[in-house]
């Protein structure tokens, strides 16, 4: 409505004697600024005077003067928006209606605010959620419709008269909408808080009690139970009786059903507060509890661990680890259900008691083959001794033992024989699955662990075998000791170190690289003729006639071997020189005559010199001296000299006769 002044403030304000009131207020005048403001207490409109009557608590005029008695009431507003008021202290008789008379240049307005001042501080109000359940966080609210800047207060929470540990959050509101002080407490109630008194206490700044509000907590919770057992330690022997009783110490709302559980599983037909177990067996050992339900849910008691004691049951042995490798460690564990736990153990290996082993575990640090077998145990507790179970088998694995390579052939073995070897061993676990042989060869393995060497070589010295399961064990190598005829027989010149010259002393050696057996004989031959039976063949003074092809033979009991033919070469100066003439020693003049210097030399003649009857050397140096045409003057005695690297040789004189031709005779 545009004809009204617009005000905003709380409808009613609350306070108590001696406190104060802070009145938040805003307005909007119809026109212009505020020119006059009067605060009335219980104003009444006088129709006659057309003015308001009542106690004037505050008055402001155009000149801004305020009577001194009005200091209790303060106008904290302004001329156009704010109309906030403060009364400090406030008195009981300030209760009623406050009238704010506002005047502008042309308009007037009376705004009414209710003030409720009580004789004593009024109590705050506790607000609870509609339902409280155990362990679920709730917020408790304490609300007081009061707040004033000049009068500080505090709200404190108490549980059964004791300050609560949880931190509360206090908030205040002094707005045109609302005036209050509020404390909020977050709290997780437990079942034990059910029925307890919660108090919100109003205190002044010094902590002095002013007022309070109380509520009784109604905490919904599952039934809270106590379990009692006879006997109290819950330790019995098989055949004894046990009684368990379930007592409800608290339930909100009331409980509806009862049941019993063993190891978390419900026991059938057990729906009373007493559980009777007669003549218990060991299977009845376990954790027992009772469960009682209400609308909130089921509640469980603490667990009672019922121990039904019994002598050890037949034991079993666990082996870590089988099969075991020789030299490794092995642990045996004796497992036997018993209550109380066994205190003593007796161990057996292949039925024989293992002295001194009385613990649950047996440790063998280095397993050896004879530790294999069946291990069993017997457990013992205060109630008796168990039975020996079936036991566990320890398999001890190891490489083949005492491996040997055995030659099956009659001895001695000869080169070219077929040799059979076998690979033997003493024991093995697991079984031998394959064999290896050294050195490797293109040999036959006719059956497992047997090696056949066809046409055995002279140089097959040693052979070793390995028998293999998961591991290979090698035997010491065995010597085949193959016998063979002498090998690599050859002729070797010992003396002289350089070439052989006629007249030299010469020694030839018959060498061979090896022979088995070692005992040998030698034979020398030249052109099929036996020359000697020593390893050496000696010439005191060699002659060219000794040159030729020589062989030596070496033989042993297995056979004989010949060397390659070896050529003996004797070097000598030219010898047996002679001059031969062609076509003859008588030649007709004008024809051709060829003189040849023939010789025997090693190496062959490299240089010839021709001489005439005057021992005059002729300027010819080849083997043949060709005279063409021949002249009568050429008649005479000729000789030649041959030279090689060893020396020189000369021929005897040979006479050439050149006779006249018929023509020449005819001319004469």
């Amino acid at each position: 409505d545009s004809s009204k002044w617009v005000f905003e403030h709380p409808e009613t304000l609350y306070a108590w004697e001696g406190a104060c009131v802070w009145i938040p207020c805003t307005y909007r005048a119809l026109d212009g600024d505020l020119e006059s403001f009067i605060l009335f207490h219980n104003p009444e409109y006088n129709k006659n005077t057309s003015k308001f009557d009542g106690t004037r608590l505050y008055e402001s005029t155009k000149d801004g003067k305020v009577p001194s008695e009005q200091k209790r009431v303060q106008f904290l507003g302004d001329k156009n928006k704010n109309c906030t008021l403060s009364i400090h202290p406030v008195h009981l008789n300030d209760s009623g209606q406050l009238g704010l008379r506002m005047e502008s240049k042309t308009e007037k307005w009376m705004e009414r605010i209710h003030l409720n001042v009580s004789e004593r501080p009024f109590p705050p109000h506790i607000q609870l959620p509609p339902e409280i359940q155990e362990s679920q966080e709730v917020t408790l609210t304490c609300l007081l419709n009061f707040s004033c800047y000049g009068y500080p207060i505090q709200l404190q929470w108490l549980l059964e008269g004791v300050p609560m540990r949880q931190a509360a959050v206090t908030s205040t509101s002094l707005t045109i909408k609302s005036v209050f002080t509020r404390s909020e407490l977050k709290f997780s109630p437990q079942w034990s808080h059910h029925g307890k008194i919660v108090t919100c206490q109003l205190q002044d700044a010094d902590g002095k009690f002013l007022s309070n509000d109380t509520v009784q907590l109604n905490v919904k919770h599952t039934p809270k139970l106590e379990i009692k057992v006879t006997p109290s330690d819950a330790i019995v022997r098989e055949g004894d009786s046990v009684t368990m009783t379930c007592e409800v110490s608290s339930s909100n709302p009331e409980y509806t059903t009862v049941s019993w559980l063993k190891d978390g599983t419900s026991l059938k037909k057990q729906n009373t507060f007493t559980l009777n177990l007669r003549e218990v067996t060991k299977d009845q050992s376990g954790k027992y509890c009772c469960q009682v339900s209400n609308d909130v849910g089921p509640g469980r008691s603490e667990e009672v661990f019922l121990q039904v004691q019994y002598a050890p049951e037949p034991s079993t042995v666990q082996i870590l680890h089988s099969p075991a490798v020789e030299g490794s460690q092995v642990e045996f564990l004796c497992m036997s259900l018993a209550n109380p736990l066994p205190t003593n153990y007796t161990w057996y290996h292949n039925g024989k008691e293992m002295q001194g082993r009385t613990e649950e575990k047996v440790h063998i640090p280095k397993i050896l083959p004879w530790h294999a077998g069946t291990y069993s145990c017997v457990a013992e507790n205060i109630l008796g001794t168990g039975q020996r179970g079936p036991g566990a088998e320890l398999d001890v694995q190891y490489p083949p033992k005492k491996v040997t390579t055995v030659i099956q052939n009659p001895m001695p073995i000869r080169e070219g024989d077929t040799v059979t070897l076998s690979c033997n061993y003493n024991s093995s676990n697991p079984s031998v699955t394959r064999y290896e042989w050294k050195p490797h060869g293109a040999w036959e393995e006719p059956s497992l662990g047997v090696l056949k060497i066809q046409n055995v070589g002279w140089d097959n010295t040693t052979i070793a075998c390995a028998a293999c399961n998961s591991w290979c064990s090698w035997a010491s190598p065995v010597a085949l000791n193959v016998q063979y005829a002498p090998r690599d027989v050859r002729v070797r010149k010992i003396k002289p170190l350089s070439e052989i010259h006629s007249g030299n002393s010469v020694s030839l050696q018959c060498d061979f690289s090896s022979s088995h057996p070692k005992e040998v004989q030698f034979f020398w031959e030249k052109n099929g003729r036996l020359l000697g039976k020593e390893s050496q063949l000696n010439f005191d003074s060699i002659s060219p006639e000794d040159a030729g092809s020589y062989s030596c033979w070496v033989n042993n009991s297995i056979g004989q071997t010949a060397s390659k033919a070896w050529t003996l070469e004797v070097l000598y100066a030219p010898r047996r020189l002679r001059v031969s003439m062609s076509p003859g020693d008588q030649v007709m003049e004008g024809k051709s005559a060829t003189l040849t210097c023939e010789s025997d030399a090693n190496p062959p003649v490299s240089h010839y010199t021709w001489f005439d009857w005057n021992n005059q050397s002729l300027p010819y140096h080849s083997q043949k001296l060709r005279l063409e045409p021949v002249k009568v003057q050429h008649s005479g005695a000729y000789w030649c000299q041959g030279t090689n690297s060893v020396g020189k040789g000369r021929s005897p004189l040979s006479t050439l006769t050149v006779y006249y031709s018929p023509e020449t005779i005819g001319r004469r």
């Epitope: 613990e359 640090p365 280095k366 397993i367």
Partner: antibody, heavy 122, light 107 residues
Framework: QVQLQQSGAEQVKPGASVKMSCKAS????????IEWMKQNHGESLDWIGN????????EYNEKFKGKATLTVEKSSNTVFLELSRLTSDDSAVYYC???????????????WGTGTTVTVSS | DIVMTQSQKFMSTTVGDRVSITCKAG??????VAWYQQKPGQSPKLLIY???TRYIGVPERFTGSGSGTDFTLTITNMQSEDLADYFC?????????FGTGTKLELK
């Protein structure tokens, strides 16, 4: 009857070495380790070490490493203890003892040798 | 090393007496304790193993007890042939160690 026969008493000079023997009989020699003990003039016993005749495995007390050497001769069922760089502290009775069939190093001893007295004196 | 202490070096006794020889281990050795008897010029002889088990052929008057750190060898009805040195030994930990011995003498 299980027996461990030890070699006779030894009188040796300081700095020298001594090798004593222990011959086993009455049981399978290679199935039990042989332990050695030192006893000073009727006083407490000290464990020296052990050897297994099956595989010549040895183990020594840290205190006797470098002093004692154990060896075995399977062909004669004999174990040897050699003590080197002898001093007067080595004068004692040395016992060979049969160890545990299951090779436990944590054991007690039921079969003792006859003992070898070693006297180290210049 | 675990020290085995036999606090009494000598003990005087008479024939027919009940004698208790004690041995204290430097740390818990469970029941891994053996007792030996040694007569002058002889090798030690095993009497008890596993703290309380009598070895084959050992007379019933010898009993062993204890576990952890405290052990006792008891001879009920002491005989003159029982005059000897007695040693305890632990075999719970390596190296194996022996007590210093207790010598039984006639009063």
């Amino acid at each position: 009857q299980v027996q461990l026969q030890q070699s006779g008493a030894e009188q040796v000079k300081p700095g020298a070495s001594v090798k004593m023997s222990c011959k086993a009989s009455g049981y399978t020699f290679t199935t039990y380790p042989i332990e050695w003990m030192k006893q000073n003039h009727g006083e407490s016993l000290d464990w020296i070490g052990n050897i297994h005749p099956y595989n010549d495995d040895t183990e020594y007390n840290e205190k006797f490493k470098g002093k004692a050497t154990l060896t075995v001769e399977k062909s004669s069922n004999t174990v040897f203890l050699e003590l080197s760089r002898l001093t007067s502290d080595d004068s004692a009775v040395y016992y060979c003892v049969r160890g545990d069939y299951y090779n436990s190093r944590y054991w007690y001893f039921d079969v003792w040798g006859t003992g070898t007295t070693v006297t180290v004196s210049s | 090393d675990i020290v085995m202490t036999q606090s009494q070096k000598f003990m005087s006794t008479t024939v027919g007496d009940r004698v208790s020889i004690t041995c204290k281990a430097g740390q818990n050795v469970r029941t891994a304790v053996a007792w030996y008897q040694q007569k002058p010029g002889q090798s030690p002889k095993l009497l008890i193993y596993s703290a309380s088990t009598r070895y084959i052929g050992v007379p019933e008057r010898f009993t062993g007890s204890g576990s952890g750190t405290d052990f006792t060898l008891t001879i009920t009805n002491m005989q003159s042939e029982d005059l000897a040195d007695y040693f305890c030994q632990q075999y719970s930990s390596f190296p194996l160690t022996f007590g210093t011995g207790t010598k039984l003498e006639l009063k």
